[in-house]
Amino acid sequence: IWELKKDVYVVELDWYPDAPGEMVVLTCDTPEEDGITWTLDQSSEVLGSGKTLTIQVKEFGDAGQYTCHKGGEVLSHSLLLLHKKEDGIWSTDILKDQKEPKNKTFLRCEAKNYSGRFTCWWLTTISTDLTFSVKSSRGSSDPQGVTCGAATLSAERVRGDNKEYEYSVECQEDSACPAAEESLPIEVMVDAVHKLKYENYTSSFFIRDIIKPDPPKNLQLKPLKNSRQVEVSWEYPDTWSTPHSYFSLTFCVQVQGKSKREKKDRVFTDKTSATVICRKNASISVRAQDRYYSSSWSEWASVPCS
Amino acid sequence: RNLPVATPDPGMFPCLHHSQNLLRAVSNMLQKARQTLEFYPCTSEEIDHEDITKDKTSTVEACLPLELTKNESCLNSRETSFITNGSCLASRKTSFMMALCLSSIYEDLKMYQVEFKTMNAKLLMDPKRQIFLDQNMLAVIDELMQALNFNSETVPQKSSLEEPDFYKTKIKLCILLHAFRIRAVTIDRVMSYLNAS
């Protein structure tokens, strides 16, 4: 058993049918010595008396808020949560496996630049009685500071018969140098509590591996005289690291017809302009990627050909 | 600010070209190592990230873009001093900081070259003959060093009398390649920046 926060305790259980469970001793936080009784949750049934209460925790029915009283007055509370270990592996019931970029990906994180700021998000089908708390650091043995905000519900989607909820959090490394070469990964730890179930999820990454630039901005077309060709120009996104000659991007320019089946013409360039043939009803899209370290491409920025 | 469209300074351009070749070569070699050594811990998540140049060179600090010198988190240690006769920059552009930066890059390349050559000698003794260093990558390191053209003491190639542990050697190869790829990215960024300055 360990303390998650004041008066909230996590009992780790080897989870299988007929498991013996864990013996837990609760102590009433009071100078009083006698006349103390214990109850669980809203029930008035007295579970025991005395300054300590010994219980055998086996299932969720044994978890909850234990309260010690004296003469009708509440002295203190202890909330017991359960953390299930199923055949040597901690349970992952609360969050959905996003399966990207690989199986067992519960947390996904992205950074728009090298400033040390990043966003993580996760999915769940649970709508109520759910709380998250997020901690992060650079490295784990001698951790350096990363500050995370509160996790917030950022999107709701309908997936088949189920509703899916997306939560996200923003974090910022306390002293980040955009040009630094990372040797210790960022660690992100999410504590999830649903009713009386506790779970924790972790992700470990280098900022360089989670970079996804914003789409190029100010995408414009300039028709070339006496030609079907157009000059496409764009700019680096405002959120990208500066100077741009050091943090350079490379670009992919795509001409896409109205029909998805039509052949796509693609051009790759390090410049912020390109000359392409604009077909009727087609659209031109441009996306960006770090020129020197191949992390994710940005989303497309698009303009119609007409 | 967009990348300049002006023709790059011919004095700088060879280094930019060589540094791009270097990144391509090390990335290819790392990919080959990850595929060939699939049963070894060779992915970024599995290896220890070691930097053989740590405390010996200070490339990131010495080559910091001017715009980032205001960022205190970037200014850890900039006291290392190096020889200052680099030939990549036209002399009129050679400033002390640029020379320091290019000299630091040269020292990095020299250290990795020695490590890779020593490692290749061991890998050539492996009866499995599973993986060797790409000669193209070694040649590209050499070309960039020549383009930088710094006079520096030659480091003797390490020789080991004991029987090599091929498993450990292959894991060390993965560690070296990951670190060298990261340094090659920095070198490419620096060359691009200097080329645009």
């Epitope: 299988y16 049918p17 007929d18 969720f60 055949d87 040597g88 019931d93 199986n103 | 049963f39």
Partner: antibody, heavy 115, light 112 residues
């Protein structure tokens, strides 16, 4: 004590369907994940499928994906395996099993796919 | 389809020490715990070892398990006639959990 009693096995022609049941008692069935495992005559153990305690997630072996469906009725304390488009290579003893470091197995039920 | 490899058979005389190996990889045994089962003819498998080296109550202490790196092994010290059976190791793969990965199985024969 924990008990898993299986039923529903038998002889079936290729291409036909069969449903296996596994009735649980002696524990809170709705709190635990469950597996199906099979063993072809004279062969080793092969995992078939898994279902979460609440039925929210199901996982299948590639060899049965799209043909077999694992399900559970927590109000009846019963686990099911619906098998469709049966093939000769599905012939095996099928076991249900609890998920956990200590597990409990059903007695097994024989499924024979033969024309 | 078996990723965990066991020797097809091992044998020993009563009282001898018999060991069965189970060889896997970094993503299965290297990352997860190992179980061992004993299966007597015509019966369901019985758990012998869980969590690499823990014995459930009721399992004789002549059975012991161990794990090192990407391999595990089951040892029977002082093998007895009633130990003649098939033995299977089981683990998970970190990418496909909770799918069970079983070993190929080993037939233990007690001679004499």
């Amino acid at each position: 004590q924990v008990q898993l009693v299986q039923s529903g096995g038998g002889v079936v022609q290729p291409g036909r369907s069969l449903r296996l049941s596994c009735a649980a008692s002696g524990f809170t069935f709705s709190s635990y994940g469950m597996h199906w495992v099979r063993q072809a005559p004279g062969k080793g153990l092969e995992w078939v499928a898994f279902i979460r305690y609440d039925g929210s997630n199901k996982y299948y072996a590639d060899s049965v994906k799209g043909r077999f469906t694992i399900s559970r009725d927590n109000s009846k304390n019963t686990l099911y395996l619906q098998m469709k488009s049966l093939r000769a290579e599905d012939t095996a003893v099928y076991y249900c099993k609890t998920h956990g470091s200590h597990d409990n197995w059903g007695q097994g039920t024989m499924v024979t796919v033969s024309s | 389809s078996y990723v965990l490899t066991q020797p097809p058979s091992v044998s020993g005389t009563p009282g001898q020490r018999v060991t069965i190996s189970c060889s896997g990889g970094r993503s299965n045994i290297g990352s997860n715990t190992v179980k061992w089962y004993q299966q007597l003819p015509g019966t369901a498998p019985k758990l012998l070892i869980y969590g690499n080296d823990y014995r459930p109550s009721g399992v004789p202490d002549r059975f012991s398990g161990s794990k090192s790196g990407t391999s595990a092994s089951l040892a029977i010290t002082g093998v007895q006639a009633e130990d003649e059976a098939d033995y299977y190791c089981q683990s998970y793969d970190r990418g496909t959990h909770p799918a069970l990965l079983f070993g190929t199985g080993t037939k233990v024969t007690v001679l004499g």
